[in-house]
Interface confidence: low
């Protein structure tokens, strides 16, 4: 499932190349392993901004599919409680390209520990 999430992220990267979306997104670029689920939820929350800003049906569908895949993967880990993690709005704001790169890194972290 996480591998498919990366495929969708790459697809989103390709789709936004032709668009001018100047949104900045809350981005965790240095994810601590004990906060990875919290960070992932922030990424999923902010991903909806890309869908909203783009107004593009293909991006919307890909984002929707990615979120479902990620949620399925998260729930297969069971209910993980993390504490002392940053709130989404405490994270640094970065452009979409950097956001997607950091998103790929956190997904790889999940792949490496699954």
């Amino acid at each position: 499932n996480w591998v498919n999430v990366i495929s969708d992220l790459k697809k989103i990267e390709d789709l936004i190349q032709s668009m001018h979306i100047d949104a900045t997104l809350y981005t965790e670029s240095d994810v601590h392993p004990s906060c990875k689920v919290t960070a992932m939820k922030c990424f999923l929350l902010e991903l909806q901004v890309i869908s909203l800003e783009s107004g593009d049906a293909s991006i919307h569908d890909t984002v929707e599919n990615l979120i479902i895949l990620a949620n399925n993967s998260l729930s297969s880990n069971g209910n993980v409680t993390e504490s002392g993690c940053k709130e989404c709005e405490e994270l640094e704001e970065k452009n979409i390209k950097e956001f997607l790169q950091s998103f790929v890194h956190i997904v790889q972290m999940f792949i490496n520990t699954s």
Epitope: K41, E64, L74, S75, E87
Partner: antibody
């Protein structure tokens, strides 16, 4: 079309238990958080807590921690708010709402009126 | 916990006038996480503004939001009869807080 349909009004006695529901349709249930909001008669909105149906992660407002239980059943796209022992002060309208873009509440249920009286 | 204080508690204006509602936070709030809701008697609240200044789907352009840090404003440029209601601000994101509300009534 996104819809949140809540269960009907309830009249209960102090000390009784209760579970009210919020059935969603029109979107993928696991994609968004679902929050619960209390509104006591003639008063403002009070945030109670929120659940992420994707993995059942649940967060409570400090005021409601230990007073209620929020849960969700992915198989029937339904969120719940539960009391084990009602008090007269629980008399209120309770709303469920979807945490949409950036997690603000973009769609709301019609509300469930809970009356607790001896 | 962040406290949101709305003012005035009640605002009396005539249709056609401009309404300015204030929401002040006890500590700085990211503008991406500030919303405004409208609630009419016997109805559920309705989202008007999110991200401090973005209008929700279907909301008329006479509603606008602004502000940053600790001070946020909802402006209704030309009051229509259906705009008289209670308005709430909300800080959302990882934690949620509502203001106590401002009642907008017909003068």
């Amino acid at each position: 079309e996104v819809q949140l349909v809540q269960s009907g009004a309830e009249v209960k006695k102090p000390g009784e238990s209760l579970k009210i529901s919020c059935k969603v349709s029109g979107y993928f249930f696991t994609t968004y958080w679902i929050g619960w909001v209390r509104q006591m008669p003639g008063k403002g909105l009070e945030y109670m807590g929120i659940i992420y149906p994707g993995d059942s992660d649940t967060r409570y407002s400090p005021s409601f921690q230990g007073q209620v239980t929020i849960s969700a059943d992915k198989s029937i796209s339904t969120a719940y708010l539960q009391w084990s022992s009602l008090k007269a002060s629980d008399t209120a309208m309770y709303y469920c709402a979807r945490g949409g873009n950036w997690n603000c509440f973009d769609y709301w249920g019609q509300g469930t009126l809970v009356t607790v009286s001896s | 916990e962040i406290v949101l204080t709305q003012s005035p508690g009640t605002l009396s204006l005539s249709p056609g006038r401009e309404a300015t509602l204030s929401c002040r936070a006890s500590q700085s709030v990211s503008s991406s996480y500030l919303a405004w809701y409208q609630q009419k008697p016997g109805q559920a609240p309705r989202l008007l503004i999110y991200g401090a200044s973005r209008r929700a789907t279907g909301i008329p352009d006479r509603f606008s939001g602004s502000g940053s840090g600790t001070d946020f404003t909802l402006t209704i440029s030309r009051l229509e009869p259906e705009d008289f209601a209670v308005y709430y601000c909300q800080r959302y994101g990882s934690s949620h807080t509502f203001g106590q509300g401002t009642k907008l009534e017909i003068k």
